[in-house]
Amino acid sequence: RGVFRRDAHKSEVAHRFKDLGEENFKALVLIAFAQYLQQCPFEDHVKLVNEVTEFAKTCVADESAENCDKSLHTLFGDKLCTVATLRETYGEMADCCAKQEPERNECFLQHKDDNPNLPRLVRPEVDVMCTAFHDNEETFLKKYLYEIARRHPYFYAPELLFFAKRYKAAFTECCQAADKAACLLPKLDELRDEGKASSAKQRLKCASLQKFGERAFKAWAVARLSQRFPKAEFAEVSKLVTDLTKVHTECCHGDLLECADDRADLAKYICENQDSISSKLKECCEKPLLEKSHCIAEVENDEMPADLPSLAADFVESKDVCKNYAEAKDVFLGMFLYEYARRHPDYSVVLLLRLAKTYETTLEKCCAAADPHECYAKVFDEFKPLVEEPQNLIKQNCELFEQLGEYKFQNALLVRYTKKVPQVSTPTLVEVSRNLGKVGSKCCKHPEAKRMPCAEDYLSVVLNQLCVLHEKTPVSDRVTKCCTESLVNRRPCFSALEVDETYVPKEFNAETFTFHADICTLSEKERQIKKQTALVELVKHKPKATKEQLKAVMDDFAAFVEKCCKADDKETCFAEEGKKLVAASQAALGL
């Protein structure tokens, strides 16, 4: 089976059940339902999944049985629309059920919530988790899939199966260990952090497809795969791009069974043809399916072929540029992107796409000019400032990170971004700026040749979080503009924003700066978030405050928390010293 199946199936549900097996089928249907109906209780979803599974089994036994010929969207949509509390729980989403496919599925997709009103996941004691794991392993693992899927409605479903496998392995190993907590907690922390990163990366892929179209996603994929597989032929890269686009289009569209099935086929194809693709795939291809697909997705770049010819000869100096461009524009631009990307693993994907866009714009203009060759002769000179801008930005920010450390670097970014877009909600500014600040620890340790692809492509993922959160409740025209104008220019657009002079400072509210003894029992991370929340509020009250003023107030605040957390009567200390701190801060900032 290739990724594109030509053979028709009488029953799509039976076909996918047989391809995926019962365990993966059930897991993927649970993920799909939890990503659509994010507020439904676990038990309700399990019931729906069991009903769908039993139905699928009847279709496997007899593909001609009643309703077995229906599309998966029809079957799943009909099942979701049986939920009794749909109107009360989801409001207007219930209106989707009055529509016919494919409009009904599109309607469900539009109601996916990137920031659902769900309680934060609190990790129980290790013994409690191990007991639950041993008592009913299947329910325990289903609950994990459900809780992640409903909080991350665009999580890459086949990858979530891989996370669940690792989650199970962690409990299987650690619940037998002498020190269960020492074994389990670091593994769970790692899974949580990797899971958040995986969710954010996939969210960008879906945004790219849904907001900017298939061509934008394919351009991204050509650039990335050409960097990763520089020895592969252009046609090989093109084939992988086509198949990968199909996989992600399916997953982003809620077609999780098709997506998982096609991803497995793609991994199989890559491993069968690894000699033509990359020398780095050998280890990946020896692993079981879920690990294999994950490994391929993360595989390091292959070595660049020696003696690659200069690009200028055929893409600038040749008199045939316009002729070649006119004969097949997208193939010619695709080859340009492929050739440029395979020579530049040191560039970010978004930079490569900016260069390709500049090249395309130049050809569109010049090929209509009186002397095309004279017109496009200097096109590569236009690339220089585009390359230098991210290089300089990364150099400056890595220097700042090394000087300040992660927490204070995050604070610098919090101030910077709050001044740029003060209308954005404080929790969003804190979350996004904290993630932006992590670029330092993640990328600044790398040598020059790896810094830009690490940093700028990571920043694209984080800024997409800002864009999807802002889209739900738009409050800033500047954010909307940077998010919607150009996918590849989002980071330069945000970087170029200066202080918003039109912003009217927020009214001072002492309650915002009132703290209690509960801060003392928080983890270091939670305590940082409290302080960073206060910092954002401070900037919203006094956007013209200088770095020195803000630093002085934050230092006083840190000293205040430290002092009161050591006090015998913590609550009294917070009440009395807090009032003094607010007064002193107001005076220092001239509020």
Epitope: F234, P309, A328, G334
Partner: nanobody, 125 residues
Framework: EVQLLESGGGLVQPGGSLRLSCAAS????????MGWFRQAPGKEREGVSS????????FYTNSVKGRFTISRDNSKNTVYLQMNSLRAEDTAVYYC??????????????????WGQGTLVTVSS
């Protein structure tokens, strides 16, 4: 319509050299991926080397790497295969092929759309 004309085949001793040429006429975009394939008696046709006439990237099958070099002269619409350190196992009919760069894969002859008649290379003492 695209036409491909090979030349340069012949008899050569082991360790010797030959240079094959392939001249293309017709739509240049349809021939902007050009390759050399070979077929020994009783064996399947296998890819030897390919080149993009836009970009100039080259690809080789493992058994000829370091011995064969593919090159092009766009002004003459001609592709060359310089074969050095020839071995008896290189004996075959060598075919020139052309196609779209978005489709042509050296390991798969069916992805090339246009073919020459072939030229015989015999390596023997």
């Amino acid at each position: 319509e695209v036409q491909l004309l090979e030349s340069g085949g012949g008899l050569v001793q082991p360790g010797g050299s030959l240079r094959l040429s392939c001249a293309a006429s017709g739509n240049t975009y349809l021939t902007s991926c050009m390759g050399w394939f070979r077929q020994a008696p009783g064996k399947e046709r296998e890819g030897v080397s390919s080149i993009y006439t836009v970009g100039g990237s080259t690809f080789y099958t493992n058994s000829v790497k370091g011995r064969f070099t593919i090159s092009r002269d766009n002004s003459k619409n001609t592709v060359y295969l310089q074969m050095n350190s020839l071995r008896a196992e290189d004996t075959a009919v060598y075919y020139c092929a052309a196609g779209s760069p978005a489709r042509c894969r050296l390991r798969d002859p069916t992805t090339f759309d246009y073919w020459g008649q072939g030229t015989l290379v015999t390596v023997s003492s």
